[in-house]
Interface confidence: low
């Protein structure tokens, strides 16, 4: 079969090259001489020439040693063609998998790692993690599987096995008790990473373990009581800086303060952070305070250190009394965004809704209203009551101002505080549809043949919403029904216009009346270009030539008929002079129709 199983080739092969790997063979070689070729990265595209194929025998050749860490798999295609160059087989996938050799040593990510641990910690305490990588394969072989070990520890006090390293993860932990910073402030560990899961090549690095001072002094507030004044509503306002002293090593985790609000902040209004330089607790507002709801907050703040206490110590607590200062607050519309349903086209002066705001301040401030943004200029707002009325015609179908049936208005409320403040609200008028648009056909110009004419399908559109739309009804007016028929389809959303009588080539007005489900009627004039042609037409062809007449007698008869027709036409013009001019074409067409009929008889 024209199939090759995946081929495994070890990296770093010694040759000799070219080295035969596998033979491509097509069973079509019984019928014709076959020539073999390969394509793909490693053959005819970069890295070119790694692989080749003996053209006539099909032997797949390796031209040089492979490097798995560079390319771990090659995907080639084998081709077989006959002597005349015609392909005799579909291209065949050839997968060449480069198998790993342990040709890389592990490498630590750093030459020196640094970690720290508190003095006096219990065995099992994690100190740090070191990492080594190996480019070799660690999935299918152990070539890249790294095992960690500690080669040596300096100094060896109180003994030489103070630390251990997890052979797989590289996590260094305390294994013995007795870490004493005063005796040994720092240990240097020589660490090893060995591939083959501990049986292969080894590399070394250094891990420095700093022994930290234990946190045996608690931070203390100085002073313990604070008083602060904060304007209401301000977020991120610095309320107070709380100062602590700590006898532990400055700028160490045992000295750096961590502050917590432990009481008095049920509303979660405050937050406290540690200033990175001064170590002070910076108390700020997380939410705006509300003078009207609570004019004073008594907070209890506790301070600890970044590092846990090494011995049992009392945790200091400070009291912060926060006085809230009153400020004039902006009126707030209730709700901030109000949705009101209103019928389009309501009379001018008709009330739409009342939209009012509330003032958060305790004083009974007067609120006045005005419209801030009314794109179409349809509304007015009473400054005292907040009553919104229509001053223009609300039109749901106005695409410039109305989106998805919604007309958006922004209103403003202003109090009479000192200084005055303003608040805005959004009024979303959902315009309820009324049947104020009749249906219209599209297109309004048609071209049609006067012989075997194709029915013209016109789409019907109505700007209104259901139920003021389909099903539609169609009717021809102003005598258009003499020559035309109009029929609405079963779905009720298109109208079919047909020519039912012969008309001569010319342009005609078809008066089409369409009405919707709510009986809203719309008259549209369709401009119909009638052409001298059969069946379908886009534009009229050149002047229409009738069938050739018979002999001379025929020609004479025609001449008589023409004279008679002219006389009749003159008579009709006199008789129906008052009749609408637009019918004139249809009269002429009728006369022509008589002529055509005679011509056909003559023929």
């Amino acid at each position: 079969d024209w199939v090759v199983a995946p081929i495994s080739v070890p990296e770093n092969g010694k040759g000799p090259f070219p080295q035969r790997l596998n033979q491509l063979k097509s069973n079509k070689d019984r019928d014709t001489k076959i020539f073999y070729s390969i394509t793909g990265p490693g053959a005819d595209s970069p890295p070119e020439g790694v692989f080749a194929v003996e053209k006539e025998t099909g032997w797949l050749l390796l031209n040089k040693p492979l490097d798995r860490e560079e390319i771990a798999k090659y995907e080639l295609f084998g081709h077989a063609v006959s002597e005349n160059g015609a392909s005799v087989e579909d291209p065949m996938n050839i997968s060449i998998i480069v198998t790993d050799q342990n040709d890389h040593k592990p490498k630590f990510t750093q030459d020196t790692f640094r970690g720290s641990v508190l003095e006096g910690v219990l065995p099992g305490t994690s100190v740090m993690q070191v990492t080594a990588t190996d480019e070799d394969d660690a999935i299918y072989t152990y070539n890249g599987v790294v095992a960690y070990s500690i080669h040596s520890q300096e100094p060896k006090d109180p003994h030489d096995l103070m630390f251990t390293i997890h052979r797989s993860t590289g996590t260094i932990s305390v294994i013995s008790s007795g870490l004493d910073r005063e005796k040994v402030p720092e240990y240097t560990l020589t660490i090893q990473a060995t591939d083959m899961d501990g049986d292969g090549s080894t590399t070394t690095a250094v891990a420095v373990v700093e022994i930290l001072d234990a946190n045996d002094n608690a931070p203390m507030f100085e002073p313990q009581k604070y008083e602060a004044w904060v304007p209401e509503n301000e977020v991120g306002h610095e309320v107070q800086r709380l100062t602590v002293t700590d006898l532990d090593v400055p700028n160490s985790p045992a000295w750096r303060a961590t502050y917590h609000i432990v009481g008095g902040d049920d509303g979660d209004h405050f937050t406290i952070t540690t200033h990175p330089e001064t170590n002070q607790g910076v108390l700020t507002t997380k939410k705006g305070l509300d003078f009207e709801a609570q004019d004073q907050h008594t907070l209890y703040v506790e301070v600890t250190n970044e590092a846990p206490f090494a011995v049992k110590l009392p945790t200091a607590t400070a009291t912060v009394v926060v006085h809230v200062k009153d400020v004039n607050e902006a009126p707030v519309f209730v709700p901030p965004s109000k949705v009101v349903e209103v019928q389009e086209g309501i009379p001018t002066g008709e009330p739409v809704c009342v939209y009012t705001a509330e003032d958060p301040d305790k004083e009974n401030q007067k609120i006045s209203y005005r419209i801030l943004r009314d794109p179409a200029g349809w509304l007015a707002m009473d400054p005292d009551s907040g009553q919104v009325t229509a001053v223009g015609t609300l039109d749901r179908e106005d695409e410039q101002f109305v989106r998805n049936n919604i007309y958006e208005v922004m209103v403003l409320a202003m109090d009479n505080g000192s200084p005055p403040t303003t608040g805005t609200g959004t009024l979303l008028l959902t315009l309820i549809d009324v049947n104020d648009h009749g249906p219209v056909p599209e297109p309004r110009q048609i071209t049609i043949c006067n012989q075997s004419p194709v029915r013209q399908v016109l789409n019907i559109t109505d700007k209104d919403l259901s139920p003021h739309t389909s099903p539609f009804q169609a009717q021809l007016t102003d005598d258009s029904d003499i020559y035309w028929t109009a029929e609405v389809n079963e779905e009720g959303d298109t109208v079919v216009l047909s020519l039912k009588k012969f008309l001569k080539q010319d342009t005609y007005d078809v008066h089409l009346s369409l009405s919707d489900h709510g009986n809203k009627e719309q008259l549209t004039v369709i401009r119909a270009t009638v052409c001298d042609c059969h069946g379908h037409v886009e534009t009229c062809p050149g002047p229409w030539k009738g069938g050739s007449g018979g002999g001379g007698s025929g020609a004479g008869v025609i001449a008589v008929i023409v004279v008679v027709v002219i006389a009749i036409v003159a008579g009709i013009v006199v008789l129906v002079i008052s009749r609408k001019k637009r019918m004139a074409k249809y009269e002429k067409a009728e006369i022509k129709e008589m002529g055509e009929m005679h011509r056909e008889l003559n023929a």
């Epitope: 961590t258 917590h260 432990v262 009481g263 008095g264 902040d265 049920d266 008594t298 907070l299 209890y300 506790e302 600890t304 970044e306 590092a307 846990p308 206490f309 049992k312 110590l313 009392p314 945790t315 607590t317 009291t319």
Partner: antibody, heavy 123, light 113 residues
Framework: VQLVEESGPGLVAPSQSLSITCTVS????????INWVRQPPGKGLEWLGV???????NYDSALKSRLTISKDNSKSQVFLKMNSLQTDDTARYYC?????????????????WGQGTTVTVSS | ELVMTQSPSSLAVSVGEKVTMSCKSS????????????LAWYQQKPGQSPKLLIY???TRESGVPDRFTGSGSGTDFTLTISSVKAEDLAVYYC?????????FGGGTKLEIK
């Protein structure tokens, strides 16, 4: 160390309020926070709230709107007041002391508990 | 809020047997700054108030017999009674105090065969 709940009537009508007093001895309320915990009949424990040494409080969010914990340090008394009681508030109510005032003490753990007072909500 | 789940809900053992009960939290109770697990274990004997056995997940409260041992970290915790006595008949509750509101597990009822 002792905590004794002194309660009003054991029976409370629905929509009425409940008041319980916890009187402590052997330690100061300025040094130890006091928790309130309840246990419906045949069910598990439910933490209601805590009052810290400085008088600050934390409540279970579901009960916050109708629960008030206060204290009188000089009388060594802690008070629980709960409004708008319903039948599912029927339980044994305990006051319990935190191990200490500081995080280091494991102050969320409660080392001394009162004997509890039974409250039945029924019309 | 943090949800505490205890299992089994009840178990029956003979005097002298070793018993373990589990408590799982919906999030880690280990605080990285101090490497402490904010978990306590209580014992409630029939008709009595709860009694604190263990805090910080593994620290035995003074006066608690050393047959009671707490272990675990993060989200999985265990209370072990190395050799059950008849007086250990009770419901055992775990409780987290990592975040508000403090929450208890549903309890494990220990019965003596």
């Amino acid at each position: 160390v002792q905590l004794v709940e002194e309660s009003g009537p054991g029976l409370v009508a629905p929509s009425q309020s409940l008041s319980i007093t916890c009187t402590v001895s052997g330690f100061s309320l300025t040094s130890y926070p006091i928790n309130w915990v309840r246990q419906p009949p045949g069910k598990g424990l439910e933490w209601l709230g805590v009052i810290w040494t400085g008088g600050g409080t934390n409540y279970d969010s579901a009960l916050k709107s109708r629960l008030t914990i206060s204290k009188d340090n000089s009388k060594s008394q802690v008070f629980l007041k709960m409004n708008s009681l319903q039948t599912d508030d029927t339980a044994r109510y305990y006051c319990a002391r935190s191990r200490g005032a500081y995080d280091f003490d494991g102050r969320g753990a409660m080392d001394y508990w009162g004997q509890g007072t039974t409250v039945t909500v029924s019309s | 809020e943090l949800v505490m789940t205890q299992s089994p809900s009840s178990l029956a053992v003979s005097v002298g047997e070793k018993v373990t009960m589990s408590c799982k939290s919906s999030q880690s109770l280990l605080y990285s700054s101090n490497q402490k697990n904010y978990l306590a274990w209580y014992q409630q004997k029939p008709g009595q108030s709860p009694k604190l056995l263990i805090y910080w997940a593994s620290t035995r409260e003074s006066g608690v017999p050393d047959r009671f041992t707490g272990s675990g970290s993060g989200t999985d915790f265990t209370l072990t009674i190395s050799s059950v006595k008849a007086e250990d008949l009770a419901v055992y509750y775990c409780q987290q105090y990592y975040s508000y509101p403090y929450t208890f597990g549903g309890g494990t009822k220990l019965e003596i065969k």
